[in-house]
Structures are given as C-alpha cells and as structure tokens.
C-alpha cells in the first residue's frame, strides 16, 4: 500500500489527521459510506482539543460524527474504545428518545449547535465530517 503524507485537496490538516467538512446533508449511513469511499471514516473525537478544532470548522450546525449504537453499545467507527474515551454529551444525553414519531429510538451521534453531542434518528440528513490519518498505509488489497 502507499502511505499518505499530505492531505488531499479540499481537506484540512490538523494534528496528523485530515478532515473534510461537508456542506450538504446525508443520513448517517450515507455519510458513513461517503467517508469510506474517500478512504476515510466519520470523524472520531478523541480529545477536547480535537473537539474544539471540529467545532470551530462546523459552526452551530448539526453534524454527524462516527459514533453510533445501532447494534447495542455505543461504538466508534474506527474501533476506538468508547467507554474509556473522550465524551462530550449534552446534559441527559444520550437518551434514545422514542418521542419523535419516526419509529425506533436514536442511534447516531451528532454535534449540536453548541458543539456538545446528542443522539438522534440516523435517517436525519445532517452534515458530516470525514477524517483520515496521515502516515497510515492505505489498505490496498492485492489483485488475485
């Protein structure tokens, strides 16, 4: 595989990662697929410093991140441990609210207008952030 040493065009470099900020909305799963096609993943927030960086770039807009509990426990899309990791939920969140009338609860996490996190219906068309790490060899499979 080839090692990525600088960020692609239209991506923002920060602390050895590259970030891409959407300007339109998609459902969480579609945003997840989008990032995967960019050889990236929905943003995984591992520190207060990274939280502030992302918050600065997205502004006061609901924005998906790479955190969900669609299969039970909360999980980060890159495997980062949720229980021991950084969290920035709004008070009384996540609440898996069923009162929205859209069916089911709330299984996907997003940045709210003040940057703190909320769980919401995964089908909502929010903006999103993709992240990929520099110096990580791309997982190019061998041709059979």
């Amino acid at each position: 595989g080839s090692e990525r040493t600088c960020c692609p065009v239209n991506w923002v470099e920060h602390e050895r990662s590259c970030y891409w900020f959407s300007r339109s909305g998609k459902a969480w799963a579609d945003a997840d697929n989008y990032c995967r096609l960019e050889d990236a993943h929905l943003v995984v927030v591992t520190s207060w410093e990274e939280q502030k960086f992302v918050q600065h770039h997205i502004g006061p807009v609901n924005t998906w991140m790479g955190l969900h509990d669609q299969n039970g426990p909360w999980k980060w899309v890159d495997g980062t441990d949720y229980e021991t990791g950084f969290k920035n939920w709004r008070p009384e969140q996540p609440d898996d609210w069923y009162g929205h009338g859209l069916g089911g609860g709330e299984d996907c996490a997003h940045f709210t207008d003040d940057g703190r996190w909320n769980d919401d219906v995964c089908q909502r068309p929010y903006r999103w952030v993709c992240e990929t790490e520099l110096d990580k060899a791309s997982q190019e499979p061998p041709l059979l």
């Epitope: 239209n10 339109s24 459902a27 995967r36 096609l37 960019e38 050889d39 791309s138 499979p141």
Partner: antibody, heavy 118, light 107 residues
Framework: EVQLLESGGGLVQPGGSLRLSCAAS????????MSWVRQAPGKGLEWVSV????????FYADSVKGRFTISRDNSKNTLYLQMNSLRAEDTAVYYC???????????WGQGTMVTVSS | DIQMTQSPSSVSASVGDRVTITCRAS??????LAWYQQKPGKAPKLLIS???NLQSGVPSRFRGSGSGTDFTLTITSLQPEDFATYCC?????????FGPGTKVDIK
C-alpha cells in the same frame, strides 16, 4: 488530457466469465473512487459498482452482488470488473467513470460492449 | 432504493426554444442530484452537479434547480448541438440511481 479507456468486452455464453479493464490517464488515479456503470441496449443507465481510491472499500448493485468484483491496480492506473455467472440481462455497454466529491461522475470512458448470449 | 422518474420522456423542440425537463426522486435527496447529456453511441457527459452547479466548460444556457424531491433542468435557448438525451442521477444514497432519460429531438 484526462482519459478513461475500457477494454475486454465481447460475446460470452450465459454462465460464462469476462474481465473488463479501464486504463486511466491524465489524473492521479489513486486519489479517486471509480465506478462501473452500464447501459443495456435502448435502456437507461444503471450503476453497477464503486471502489475507493485504495480499493479498500467497494459497493455493488444488488443485481450483480456476488457475481461481479470490482478491483484496481493503482501501479498500473487500471480499474477492473470481473464478471462471473453472466446472464442475458447483463448484456450492455459497460462504462468506467471517475467519481467526484458530489458522488456523481465527471469523466467517462467510451464504453465496451458485453453481449451474453448462447 | 431511491427511484428516479423524469418527464417528459421525449420533447420535440426547435432551435432557440426554451426546454424544461423535470426529475423527481422517490424520497428527499437534498441537493444530491446530477444531470447528464448523452448522444447516440457516446458516453454520458456531466452537465450539472449538486442540483445547480454548472460543470466547467458547459454553456450557461443549461440551468439546474430544485431541492428535496423535485428538480428541473432548463435549456434557455436550444442550440443544434443540444439535441440529445438528458438524464438525472441521485447521489444521495447507494445504490446510485439514474432517471430513465428525456430525449430532446428536432420538431
């Protein structure tokens, strides 16, 4: 000049296999996701498959899942579509296309015709 | 899967005419819509991205508009080279899906 050139089409019997190739030039191939899109005679366009720039992520239309495999060799600037268990309904012109940040396709090859018939 | 429909399926027009083609998605797709032009025996050509963004080199007589489920491609003054088939594509969700096309031919 940005260019895509498909090859490998032809006549194949039902149940047979074929491998299509798409040679890319004029852009940094490994930086872009690439797709295959097909068009049956007299019909509209149908998206078939897409792969990320590294080849590490792939998606398929339900109509070809389990039968077709998309892959790429970035050292050769080439995209592939391995087609197995071919059916009459796979008869079409197959185009390779370069994906944009808007999830659409800005560069297309000239197409290669695949005919599945006994 | 998101279904895309177009109307009309064909339109006869003259040089200089204003032509309007509509595309409808079976569910909301925000502005994730592209328009293509295709001539017989040729590959499609991307005209418009993100519902209204004109591709570089595409004449300004082509205009895209709409959001959600209803979209429009307008050719403000039809030129001889514009006689072709036009189709839309939703870029919101996999699998990406195309409209059936609208053929613009000479009246």
């Amino acid at each position: 000049e940005v260019q895509l050139l498909e090859s490998g089409g032809g006549l194949v019997q039902p149940g047979g296999s074929l491998r299509l190739s798409c040679a890319a030039s004029g852009f940094i191939f490994s930086s872009y996701a690439m797709s295959w899109v097909r068009q049956a005679p007299g019909k509209g366009l149908e998206w078939v498959s897409v792969t990320s720039g590294s080849g590490g992520t792939t998606f398929y239309a339900d109509s070809v899942k389990g039968r077709f495999t998309i892959s790429r060799d970035n050292s050769k600037n080439t995209l592939y579509l391995q087609m197995n268990s071919l059916r009459a309904e796979d008869t079409a012109v197959y185009y390779c296309a370069k994906r944009t940040q808007f999830d659409d396709f800005d560069i297309w090859g000239q197409g290669t015709m695949v005919t599945v018939s006994s | 899967d998101i279904q895309m429909t177009q109307s009309p399926s064909s339109v006869s027009a003259s040089v200089g005419d204003r032509v309007t083609i509509t595309c409808r998605a079976s569910q909301g797709i925000s502005n994730w819509l592209a328009w293509y032009q295709q001539k017989p025996g040729k590959a499609p050509k991307l005209l418009i991205s993100a519902a209204s963004n004109l591709q570089s080199g595409v004449p300004s007589r082509f205009r895209g508009s709409g959001s959600g489920t209803d979209f429009t491609l307008t050719i403000t003054s039809l030129q001889p080279e514009d006689f072709a088939t036009y189709c839309c594509q939703q870029a919101n969700s996999l699998p990406f899906t195309f409209g059936p096309g609208t053929k613009v031919d000479i009246k």
